[in-house]
């Protein structure tokens, strides 16, 4: 008799893939657009990228530092109108993008929760919350939420409105923290909240701690759905240097989570190459003419346009990693056990009941190495074949589709490799 | 400053085991990997092995691999180098070699020990 | 494994004039990804552990004289002493750094003539 198929898990839509964060409209857009309308232009775009949703803003009416003059029901006239909103929405649900929208209220202040007036503008977001579920949002992002004097219980009554309209609605909350014990008390006072956070950030340039924070932060939240990324907002070269970036991709893809990029992410791109322009923001490149101020400073390998015609680019890697994350069950809600590998390799089995399982060996390390993958550390539900195929290298030049031998697999400096295996009973 | 500094000279019989210990100060010690070279007398340098101190992680050099453990403890910033099964050919100066995380080559070492096999 | 090749065995030079030292490996050391070649060059006094002097072919450890400098890319390196000083007297180390098990060339030793 067959074995019994396990139950599947229930699934919600940013359970399915990645987010994609636009928090600048302007620098998304470029050419000194910047507006709703624009925006919607680029959903194809979006599309391209296979994320699940899109977390935009905030776009709403924000005079810096004054309470009285930031209205979370307005949608500030620079960005567009409430009908390019609708009409935003309505093409995105088309797509299958869902989007989330940033309430940050004071993002263009100091203070982004106004602290002298904390009850005034839990009072705002509130009514917000239930002005833009109506309207047909399909969830919220606030940030910086570690200058929200009793967070905890706001983001609970936060949880319970959107949750209230709908069991399918999101709330995103962001903090700069990336102190685990912070991150897991406001985690356990909010059951489906979303926590992006500067967690992993603390990896160091060299990746030398992405292992042990990545484990601790698994085995501290137990069963818990969380998400990945390096910081609630900014884009990962601020981070990670250009070596790292292929690598952190591939793990961000293939993590139990929710990844969670800004735009601009799948490209590398990186303010300190583009003189002038802001850490936070800086325009996206689409083409080479899209950052016009220093002729010839952008090159179309920088650009989403010369990424797009290169198989090997660090967009394609990316379009791939979506596609893949978003159709195997193994990667949608598989289990995850990591195991010894060497030193600077990181690897991990990704598997769910009879279907296709996935290995992952990351090498954060500057030189090429044989992966002495321990198997003994596996529990028998996810023991290793002898050999299994090469889904994808983060690097040129090998071979995919090929069958590796694991007892001899090597890894070039920063290389990392996706690995797919059957199901043996 | 950064120092290794390592067990003195050792003597042993063929067959025995020998454990060659580094101890590193002036830097965090788990923020560094530590590598193991020997040296025969007026010979060149041999590669064998490497640890991550920060959790224990190995790699071996084919040649020794079955022979050779390294190990550490954090508590007192020290790396460990223990050749099993030794012959009269491992009679050599055996050195440990920091590198920075993810490195291959080496930016302190220790003065050696020189560890003789004879019957 | 990387086979390292280093000549000449040793080498006479007078105080002041340029020593050169070659080291050939057989295959290429150049990371594609970051442009680097991963050659890093030791010098090693009687009774002492060896000293690094550069790491990636080029770049010279700190506290290393100007005076040495290393060349190279691919699967050819040149170690370059300028202007040979007395206490440069010793024997040179390559290496490679590109991919485990690190391999040493055979060392080239550097005399006064």
């Known amino acids: 008799r067959a074995p019994r198929c396990r139950e599947l898990p229930a699934q919600k839509w940013w359970h399915t893939g990645a987010l994609y964060r636009i928090g600048d409209l302007q620098a998304f857009q470029g050419h000194g657009a910047g507006n709703l309308a624009g925006l919607k232009g680029r959903l194809d775009y979006l599309s391209s990228l296979k994320v699940k949703g899109l977390v935009l803003g905030p776009i709403h009416k924000n005079q810096k530092d004054d309470v009285a003059q930031t209205d979370l029901l307005q949608i500030d006239p620079n960005f567009g109108s409430k009908e390019d909103f609708d009409s935003l929405l309505q093409s995105a649900k088309k797509k299958s993008i869902r989007v989330i929208l940033d309430l940050t209220p004071n993002y263009r202040g100091e203070n982004s929760w106004f602290s002298t007036q904390v009850d005034t503008v839990a009072t705002k977001v509130k009514d917000a919350l239930e002005f833009w579920l109506q309207a047909g949002v399909d969830g919220f992002q606030v940030r910086d939420i570690e200058n929200l004097k009793d967070a905890s219980s706001f983001l609970a009554e936060w949880q319970n409105i959107t949750k209230g309209f709908s069991e399918d609605r999101l709330l995103i909350a962001g903090t700069n923290s990336s102190d685990l014990q912070q991150i897991l008390s406001l985690l356990e006072s909010n059951k489906d909240l979303l926590l992006t956070s500067s967690y992993l950030s603390d990896s160091g340039s060299t990746g030398e701690h992405t292992k042990s924070l990545v484990t601790q932060y698994l085995n501290a939240t137990g069963n818990r759905w969380c998400s990945w990324s390096l910081s609630q907002a900014r884009l990962l070269t601020s981070f990670l240097p250009a070596q790292l970036l292929r690598l952190y991709q591939l793990m961000l893809f293939t993590l139990p989570g929710t990844p969670v990029f800004s735009y601009g992410d799948e490209i590398g791109l990186d303010a300190a190459a583009l003189p002038g322009q802001p850490m936070e923001a800086p325009v996206m490149l689409w083409d080479e003419s899209s950052f016009p101020d220093i002729p010839g400073a952008v090159s179309a390998n920088m650009t989403v346009k010369g990424q797009s015609e290169d198989p090997g680019s660090l967009l394609s890697l990316f379009r791939r990693l979506s596609d893949q994350r978003s159709k195997e069950r193994s990667l949608l809600h598989g289990d995850f056990h990591a195991f010894s590998a060497g030193p600077g390799l990181f690897s991990y089995i990704r598997h769910w009941d009879q279907n296709e399982r996935f290995l992952v060996v990351l090498n954060f390390g500057d030189v090429g190495l044989s992966a002495g993958l321990q198997a003994s550390d596996l529990p028998a539900s996810a023991s290793l074949p002898a050999k299994a195929d090469l889904l994808l290298s983060t690097q040129p030049g090998r071979e995919e589709g090929s069958p590796l031998e694991l007892e001899r697999l090597k890894l070039e400096p920063h290389e990392g490799l996706l690995l797919r295996f059957p199901y043996a009973a | 400053q950064v120092q290794l500094v390592q067990s003195g000279a050792e003597v042993k019989k063929p067959g025995a085991s020998v454990k060659v210990s580094c101890k590193a100060s002036?830097?965090?010690?788990?923020?560094?990997?530590m590598h193991w070279v020997r040296q025969a007398p007026g010979q060149g340098l041999e590669w064998m092995g490497i640890?991550?101190?920060?959790?224990?992680?190995?790699n071996y050099a084919q040649k020794f691999q079955g022979r050779v453990t390294s190990t550490v403890d954090k508590s007192i910033s020290t790396a460990y180098m223990e050749l099993s099964r030794l012959r009269s050919d491992d009679t050599v100066v055996y050195y440990c070699?920091?590198?920075?995380?993810?490195?291959?080559?080496?930016?302190?070492w220790g003065q050696g020990t020189l560890v003789t096999v004879s019957s | 494994d990387i086979v390292m090749t280093q000549s000449p065995d040793s080498l006479a030079v007078s105080l002041g004039e340029r020593a050169t030292i070659n080291c050939k490996s057989s295959?290429?050391?150049?990371?594609?990804?970051?442009?680097?070649?991963?050659l890093a060059w030791y010098q090693q006094k009687p009774g002492q552990p060896p000293k690094l002097l550069i790491y990636f072919a080029s770049t010279r450890e700190s506290g290393v004289p100007d005076r040495f400098s290393g060349s190279g890319s691919g699967t050819d390196f040149t170690l370059t002493i300028s202007s040979l000083q007395a206490e440069d007297v010793a024997v040179y180390y390559c290496q490679q750094h590109y991919s485990s098990p690190f391999t040493f060339g055979g060392g080239t030793k550097v005399e006064i003539k």
């Open positions: 002036g830097y965090t010690f788990t923020s560094y990997w």
């Open positions: 295959q290429s050391l150049l990371n594609n990804i970051n442009q680097k070649n991963y």
């Open positions: 640890i991550d101190p920060s959790d224990s992680e190995t």
């Open positions: 070699a920091r590198a920075s995380y993810g490195k291959g080559y080496f930016d302190y």
